[in-house]
Amino acid sequence: KESCDVQLYIKRQSYHSIFAGDPFKLECPVKYCAHRPQVTWCKLNGTTCVKLEGRHTSWKQEKNLSFFILHFEPVLPSDNGSYRCSANFLSAIIESHSTTLYVTDVKSASERPSKDEMASRPWLLYS
């Protein structure tokens, strides 16, 4: 019998390399049975995860999974960091693994490295 616990499918040590100025959607895949849980995003600040209140969010429904989406319209340099989603289910809090955004702050659109360049310069993601 399939478990009816809420599950959040963010992979351990997942990350996204993105550019400041681009739109980006950070998705939290949520599996639930009867009632969709309340889901929130937080951003890690040291060991504390600070709840992102009042941000642009939405839900997307697919066949067997829902996605709680945090929208970046667009990405800002300050968005660099690690994020976690959590679900409130039967008075319990279920937390996802954290996912990290590596934001490259390109000062001019013409300076943007190509995908090939990015692949050959992984250190750029961490600068």
């Epitope: 400041a20 100025g21 800002l76 702050d105």
Partner: antibody, heavy 117, light 107 residues
Framework: QVQLVQSGAEVKKPGASVKVSCKAS????????IHWVRQAPGQRLEWMGW????????KYNDKFKVRVTITRDTSASTAYMELSSLRSEDTAVYYC??????????WGQGTTVTVSS | DIVMTQSPDSLAVSLGERATINCKAS??????VAWYQQKPGQSPKPLIY???YRYSGVPDRFSGSGSGTDFTLTISSLQAEDVAVYYC?????????FGQGTKLEIK
């Protein structure tokens, strides 16, 4: 404190272009998007587009896409909105606004553009 | 485009009384709605974001509620300085769109 100061009123003939400036102070221009919104007499506010000054990336309302160009000069901490092929219905007050993650938080004082032959 | 429809178009309320302005979106905008106040000859001033979060410095007599397609701005006890036009705005889907405005006056 954060301030957005816009250029002065303009009177233009139909078919001409207008370029409105928005000078930011009290924060780093490249940290937030600048949006442009207009308000024609007796009409609702109308969102035109935004620029992310760090990279120059822009997003436009399709209604204005072929006629509007939003640019920035980071060294002057200034964003610009140019609207071409002006017609009488473009007569409006044009606002720049700084958006944080939520709403348009700080607004310029507005620039009145009058299109008249 | 998402159409934001406010009701009523104008509203007259006595000082100290409650004022309620409604905003209906033509499709689901989740909670991605802001409310602005605009006084004559001035730029819009943000009051509420994400449907119910008050901007710092905004008096707590202003409150917002709603999600999906139906939103409400409430002023719990009208003050003379609240006379203005109020606009809702959705930022869920491009292009961002505003309501037509509700003019609030003192009865």
């Amino acid at each position: 404190q954060v301030q957005l100061v816009q250029s002065g009123a303009e009177v233009k003939k139909p078919g001409a272009s207008v370029k409105v400036s928005c000078k930011a102070s009290g924060y780093t221009l490249t940290d937030y998007t600048i949006h442009w919104v207009r308000q024609a007499p007796g009409q609702r506010l109308e969102w035109m587009g935004w620029i992310y000054p760090g990279s120059g990336n822009t997003k436009y309302n399709d209604k204005f896409k072929v006629r509007v160009t939003i640019t920035r000069d980071t060294s002057a901490s200034t964003a610009y909105m140019e609207l071409s092929s002006l017609r009488s219905e473009d007569t409006a007050v044009y606002y720049c606004a700084r958006r944080n993650y939520y709403a348009m938080e700080y607004w310029g004082q507005g620039t009145t553009v009058t299109v008249s032959s | 485009d998402i159409v934001m429809t406010q009701s009523p178009d104008s509203l007259a309320v006595s000082l100290g009384e409650r004022a309620t302005i409604n905003c209906k979106a033509s499709q689901n905008v989740f909670t991605n709605v802001a409310w602005y106040q605009q006084k004559p000859g001035q730029s819009p001033k943000p009051l509420i974001y994400s449907a119910s979060y008050r901007y710092s410095g905004v008096p707590d007599r202003f409150s917002g509620s709603g999600s999906g397609t139906d939103f409400t701005l409430t002023i719990s006890s009208l003050q003379a300085e609240d006379v203005a036009v109020y606009y809702c705005q959705q930022y869920s889907t491009y292009p961002y769109t505003f309501g037509q405005g509700t003019k609030l006056e003192i009865k």
